[in-house]
C-alpha cells in the first residue's frame, strides 16, 4: 500500500498506527514531539520498505531504537529533502542506536544526526555503502564514541560475524547494533543489490530483493515502478511521478494536493507528471496539462487590489518577486534601506510591463532605476493628474535612470514629469524622451532644467587608460591626466573595481545612496608632478579572476550657476594572472586489496587558473607498534589510531597522558592557540547549526488544526 503525501506523527504515539499497512510512504515521514516516554515495543511496521522523500525524528521520548519500528526500511529516496538531508535524527533523548539494519540506500541527500545524548553505534556504520557521498553528512553532539564501547556481533566471543570496511583509515567491523551487522553484497554484484543469501538482484532493483535477477522481486526500484515491475523508464502513455513510479494521464489530471491547490493542476512535461511547468516553460493555455517554452522570461501577471502598489521597503517589493506583468500603478518611495538596490533588483527585476503609471518620489536611497532591469513598457492605461504616466519628484541622490545604450523602454500613453532631482542630469532625461517615444508630449514645465542636475557634473569627458599590468593578485593601471578648464576644479580621482565574471556590469550595479555598493572604491590623489600620469596599484586580488575597473575624476560640482564638466572612464575588464591552486579537498584513501590503494579527492576550492593535472605522491609508513598494546576484546576505552603526523588527541589516550608538545621545542608548553582560520571555521559551524535549528523549528511547529 502506498501512503501519502507525507505522514506527520506528533504528540500521540498511537498515531503510529497510521503506518500499519504502508509499504511505501510517498512523501516524508515525521515522527516528532512525543514528550511522554512510551513503550514502543508493540509497534512494528515490517511492511514499510521505502520512503520517497525523507525521514525526520525529533524529540520522541522513550524511543531507543528504530530497528524494531522499521525492521525492513530499505530505501530513503530523498526526492525532496529536509534542508539538504534525507535522514534527520535530532534531539532524540533516549535513542541508543539507529538500528535500521535493512537500510541499504539513501538515493539523494545527506544525513544529519545531532544532539542525541545517548546515541551510539554511529562510528560502526559505513555510510558510504548507503550514500553516494558522505562529505555532507553531519554527525555531531551525540554520545562520545569512547563512552559507547560499540561492539559488533560476535566480537566479544572472538567470532566476529560482520564484515570490515575502512573509514578514515580505520579498518573495522560494520554493524548497526550489538546483534545486527551492516549488510554488504558480494563484490561480484558490483553496484547491484543482493538477497539475504547474497545472490545478486536484477539491475533494476535497489536496496534488496526477495529473489535473484527478477525485476518483479525488488524491494525498491533503482529507477521506476510500474504495475509490479521495476523499469528503467516509464512505458508509453505513463509518466514519471514523485521520482519513483509511473502513473497515467488520468491520475495526473486528478491530483489535488494541498501544495498545488492554487495552481491549475498538474502538468505532463518531458515524460513527467509535475506540479508546475519547469523554469522556462509555460502552460499551453490556462487549463492545459502540457507545457511550451516561454519566449524570454515566463510571464507572471501580478495585480494590485488597490490599483496602486507602494514600494517603500524590501518587504513590499518582495510581493512582486517573479512578476513580469504588473497590472496597476507603481509608486516607489524608498527613503532608506540596507543593500536596497540589489534587493529591489532581486524582487522587481523581472517586471517587463506596467499597465498604469510609475511614480518615483522622495526615494533618497536610489542612485539609479536600473533595478527595474527588464522594464520595457509602461502602458499608461491609468495616469496621474495632468496626464503623467512617468513621474519623478524629489529624489536627492538619483543619478541615472537606465543605461540607455542597452535599454528599450516605451511609454505608450501619458507624459513624463521630472522635478527636484539635483543629481539627475537633464541630458539623461532628454535621452529618456528619445528612447521612450515621449518627445513632444511634455510641456515646458514638465522637465525642470533648473532643479534637475543642479548638484551634478553633468557633462562628462572620457578618461582614457594608458597602461595595465597584472600579476597573480595585483593590477597596476594608469590613465591620462585630466585637465578641466580650471585646474583648481579637479580634486582627485576615485578608482572603482570589483570581480566581474561576465562583461556585463554597469556603474550603478548594486549601488544605493545608503552606503551599499558592489564596487570597491580607492581614492587617488593627483600626482604632484604635472607630467606624471595618475595611476594605482590594486592589491589583495584573487588570482585568475576577471575584474571590472573604472575611474572617475572628483571635481567641484558647481561654479555659481554654471554646470561644470566631469570626467570618467569606460569600464575596463582585466584578468589577474594564474597562481598555484589551493589544496585538493576531501582526500580519502581505502585499500581494496593487499597491493592496491584507491585514492579519491575533490577539486580544490580555489583552482586559481585552469587545472590541467594532479600530482599524487605516496610513501610507505612503518607499522605502528602502539596498536598492539591494547586488548581489543575488552570493553574498555579503545584508543584511536595515531594519525600520520604523529599527533594524538590526548583525551583518547588510555595510558599516562603526556603533555602536548608545541612548536619546535621539546618540553611542556600550552596548547597552541587556534588560528584565525580555525576560529572562523568554528564560527561558521556554530552559525550553520543555528540556521538548521531555526529551519527545523519553523518547519515543524505549526498551529493546531481546528
Amino acid at each position: 500500500e502506498i501512503c501519502g503525501p507525507g505522514i506527520d506523527i506528533r504528540n500521540d504515539y498511537q498515531q503510529l498506527k497510521r503506518l500499519e499497512n504502508c509499504t511505501v510512504i510517498e512523501g516524508y515521514l515525521h515522527i516528532l514531539l512525543i514528550s511522554k516516554a512510551e513503550d514502543y515495543r508493540s509497534y512494528r511496521f515490517p511492511k514499510l520498505t521505502v520512503i520517497t522523500e525523507y525521514l525526520l525524528l525529533f524529540r520522541v521520548a522513550g524511543l531507543e531504537s528504530l530497528g524494531d519500528l522499521f525492521p525492513n526500511l530499505t530505501v530513503i529516496r530523498g526526492w525532496k529533502l529536509f534542508y539538504n538531508y534525507a535522514l534527520v535524527i535530532f534531539e532524540m533523548t533516549n535513542l541508543k542506536d539507529i538500528g535500521l539494519y535493512n537500510l541499504r540506500n539513501i538515493t539523494r541527500g545527506a544525513i544529519r544526526i545531532e544532539k542525541n545524548a545517548d546515541l551510539c553505534y554511529l562510528s560502526t556504520v559505513d555510510w558510504s555503502l548507503i550514500l553516494d557521498a558522505v562529505s555532507n553528512n553531519y554527525i555531531v553532539g551525540n554520545k562520545p564514541p569512547k563512552e559507547c564501547g560499540d561492539l559488533c556481533p560476535g566480537t566479544m566471543e572472538e567470532k566476529p560475524m560482520c564484515e570490515k570496511t575502512t573509514i578514515n583509515n580505520e579498518y573495522n567491523y560494520r554493524c548497526w547494533t550489538t546483534n545486527r551487522c551492516q549488510k554488504m553484497c558480494p563484490s561480484t554484484c558490483g553496484k547491484r543489490a543482493c538477497t539475504e543469501n547474497n545472490e545478486c538482484c536484477h539491475p533494476e532493483c535497489l536496496g534488496s530483493c526477495s529473489a535473484p535477477d527478477n525485476d518483479t522481486a525488488c524491494v525498491a526500484c533503482r529507477h521506476y515502478y510500474y504495475a509490479g515491475v521495476c523499469v528503467p523508464a516509464c512505458p508509453p502513455n505513463t509518466y514519471r511521478f514523485e521520482g519513483w513510479r509511473c502513473v497515467d494521464r488520468d491520475f495526473c489530471a486528478n491530483i489535488l494536493s494541498a501544495e498545488s491547490s492554487d495552481s491549475e493542476g498538474f502538468v505532463i512535461h518531458d515524460g513527467e507528471c509535475m506540479q508546475e511547468c519547469p523554469s522556462g516553460f509555460i502552460r499551453n493555455g490556462s487549463q492545459s496539462m502540457y507545457c511550451i517554452p516561454c519566449e524570454g522570461p515566463c510571464p507572471k501577471v501580478c495585480e494590485e487590489e488597490k490599483k496602486t502598489k507602494t514600494i517603500d521597503s524590501v518587504t513590499s517589493a518582495q510581493m512582486l518577486q517573479g512578476c513580469t506583468i504588473f497590472k496597476g500603478n507603481l509608486l516607489i518611495n524608498i527613503r532608506r534601506g540596507n543593500n536596497i538596490a540589489s534587493e529591489l533588483e532581486n524582487f522587481m527585476g523581472l517586471i517587463e510591463v506596467v499597465t498604469g503609471y510609475v511614480k518615483i518620489r522622495h526615494s533618497h536611497a536610489l542612485v539609479s532605476l536600473s533595478f527595474l532591469k527588464n522594464l520595457r513598457l509602461i502602458l499608461g492605461e491609468e495616469q496621474l493628474e495632468g496626464n503623467y504616466s512617468f513621474y519623478v519628484l524629489d529624489n536627492q541622490n538619483l543619478q541615472q535612470l537606465w543605461d540607455w545604450d542597452h535599454r528599450n523602454l516605451t511609454i505608450k500613453a501619458g507624459k513624463m514629469y521630472f522635478a527636484f532631482n539635483p543629481k539627475l542630469c537633464v541630458s539623461e532625461i532628454y535621452r529618456m524622451e528619445e528612447v521612450t517615444g515621449t518627445k513632444g508630449r511634455q510641456s515646458k514645465g514638465d522637465i525642470n532644467t533648473r532643479n534637475n542636475g543642479e548638484r551634478a557634473s553633468c557633462e562628462s569627458d572620457v578618461l582614457h587608460f594608458t597602461s595595465t599590468t597584472t600579476s597573480k593578485n595585483r593590477i597596476i593601471i594608469t590613465w591620462h591626466r585630466y585637465r578641466p578648464p580650471d585646474y583648481r576644479d579637479l580634486i582627485s580621482f576615485t578608482v572603482y573595481y570589483k570581480e566581474a565574471p561576465f562583461k556585463n556590469v554597469t556603474e550603478y550595479d548594486g549601488q544605493d545612496a545608503c552606503g551599499s555598493n558592489s564596487w570597491n572604491m580607492v581614492d587617488v590623489d593627483l600626482p604632484p608632478n604635472k607630467d606624471v600620469e595618475p595611476g594605482i596599484l590594486l592589491h589583495g586580488l584573487k588570482p585568475w579572476t576577471q575584474y571590472a575597473v573604472y575611474v572617475k575624476a572628483v571635481t567641484l560640482t558647481m561654479v555659481e550657476n554654471d554646470h561644470i564638466r566631469g570626467a570618467k572612464s569606460e569600464i575596463l575588464y582585466i584578468r589577474t594572472n594564474a597562481s598555484v591552486p589551493s589544496i585538493p579537498l576531501d582526500v580519502l584513501s581505502a585499500s581494496n586489496s593487499s597491493s592496491q590503494l584507491i585514492v579519491k579527492w575533490n577539486p580544490p576550492s580555489l583552482p586559481n587558473g585552469n587545472l590541467s593535472y594532479y600530482i599524487v605522491r605516496w610513501q610507505r609508513q612503518p607499522q605502528d607498534g602502539y596498536l598492539y598494546r591494547h586488548n581489543y576484546c575488552s570493553k574498555d576505552k579503545i584508543p584511536i589510531r595515531k594519525y600520520a603526523d604523529g599527533t594524538i588527541d590526548i583525551e583518547e589516550v588510555t595510558e599516562n597522558p603526556k603533555t602536548e608538545v608545541c612548536g619546535g621545542e621539546k618540553g611542556p608548553c600550552c596548547a597552541c592557540p587556534k588560528t584565525e582560520a580555525e576560529k572562523q571555521a568554528e564560527k561558521e559551524e556554530a552559525e550553520y547549526r543555528k540556521v538548521f535549528e531555526n529551519f527545523l523549528h519553523n518547519s515543524i511547529f505549526v498551529p493546531r488544526p481546528e
Epitope: 504502508c22 494536493s257 481546528e706
Partner: antibody, heavy 117, light 112 residues
Framework: QVQLQESGPGLVKPSETLSLTCTVS?????????WNWIRQPPGKGLEWIGY???????NYKPSLKDRVTISRDTSKNQFSLKLSSVTAADTAVYYC??????????WGQGTLVTVSS | DIVMTQSPLSLPVTPGEPASISCRSS???????????LQWYLQKPGQSPQLLIY???NRLYGVPDRFSGSGSGTDFTLKISRVEAEDVGVYYC?????????FGQGTKVEIK
C-alpha cells in the same frame, strides 16, 4: 492503494441523528483532495451530500445544509457525516468517496442506513 | 441546482450492438475556467460506482475503447460501440462544474 471504509449504526430512529465515519488509509486527508459523502436510496439514483476539503472547508447540498455536518479527525485520518432529524426518506446506502481536481477516484463499499422506529 | 436529465431510463441491448445514452443539463455546465466537468459513472449490481469518462470525452485509462463521450454546453452523450455482457449496470452522468454537484437519475442497461 487508497482505501475508504464507512462505519456506523445500520439503524437510526426517526428524528435522531445519523452518524457515520469514513476511515481513510493510504492517504492523509490533510494532504489534498475533497472527501465526500454520497447516498443512494434503495432502487434509486445517486445524491451528492457534501464534502470536507483537505484544509477543512465544507460544501454541502443546499437542500440538506440545515441538517448536515461533515467534520474530520486528522489524528485518526477519518472524516464523518452527521445528519440530524432523520426521516424514512433518509434511508439509503451511504458512500464516502474521494474527489480530486476532476473526478471521484476512490469510493468506499457503502453502508446501508435504515431509518425506522 | 442544475438538473441532469438522462434518457432513456432503461436501455435493453443486444450484445454486439451499439448503445447510446443522452444527458442534458438544465443550464450550461462550462466552468469559469473553461472546462466542462461532465463525468460518466457505471454502477454494476452490488458495487460502488466506477468512472468511465471524465471532462466530457476523456476515457479513463483501462476503460475499453468501445466507450466514448461527446457533447458540449448542455447536451452530452455516452456511446458504446458494441455492447458486451459485462457492460450491464446503471450509467450515471455527473456534473462537477457548479456546486451543488448533481447526478443524472441513471440509465439501466440490460441485455435483451
Amino acid at each position: 492503494q487508497v482505501q475508504l471504509q464507512e462505519s456506523g449504526p445500520g439503524l437510526v430512529k426517526p428524528s435522531e441523528t445519523l452518524s457515520l465515519t469514513c476511515t481513510v488509509s493510504g492517504y492523509s486527508i490533510t494532504g489534498g483532495y475533497l472527501w465526500n459523502w454520497i447516498r443512494q436510496p434503495p432502487g434509486k439514483g445517486l445524491e451528492w451530500i457534501g464534502y470536507i476539503s483537505y484544509d477543512g472547508t465544507n460544501n454541502y447540498k443546499p437542500s440538506l445544509k440545515d441538517r448536515v455536518t461533515i467534520s474530520r479527525d486528522t489524528s485518526k485520518n477519518q472524516f464523518s457525516l452527521k445528519l440530524s432529524s432523520v426521516t424514512a426518506a433518509d434511508t439509503a446506502v451511504y458512500y464516502c468517496a474521494r474527489h480530486g481536481r476532476v473526478f471521484f477516484d476512490y469510493w468506499g463499499q457503502g453502508t446501508l442506513v435504515t431509518v425506522s422506529s | 441546482d442544475i438538473v441532469m436529465t438522462q434518457s432513456p431510463l432503461s436501455l435493453p441491448v443486444t450484445p454486439g450492438e451499439p448503445a447510446s445514452i443522452s444527458c442534458r443539463s438544465s443550464q450550461s455546465i462550462v466552468h469559469s475556467n473553461g472546462n466542462t466537468y461532465l463525468q460518466w459513472y457505471l454502477q454494476k449490481p452490488g458495487q460502488s460506482p466506477q468512472l468511465l469518462i471524465y471532462k466530457v470525452s476523456n476515457r479513463l485509462y483501462g476503460v475499453p475503447d468501445r466507450f466514448s463521450g461527446s457533447g458540449s454546453g448542455t447536451d452530452f452523450t455516452l456511446k458504446i460501440s458494441r455492447v458486451e455482457a459485462e457492460d450491464v449496470g446503471v450509467y450515471y452522468c455527473f456534473q462537477g462544474s457548479h456546486v451543488p454537484w448533481t447526478f443524472g437519475q441513471g440509465t439501466k442497461v440490460e441485455i435483451k
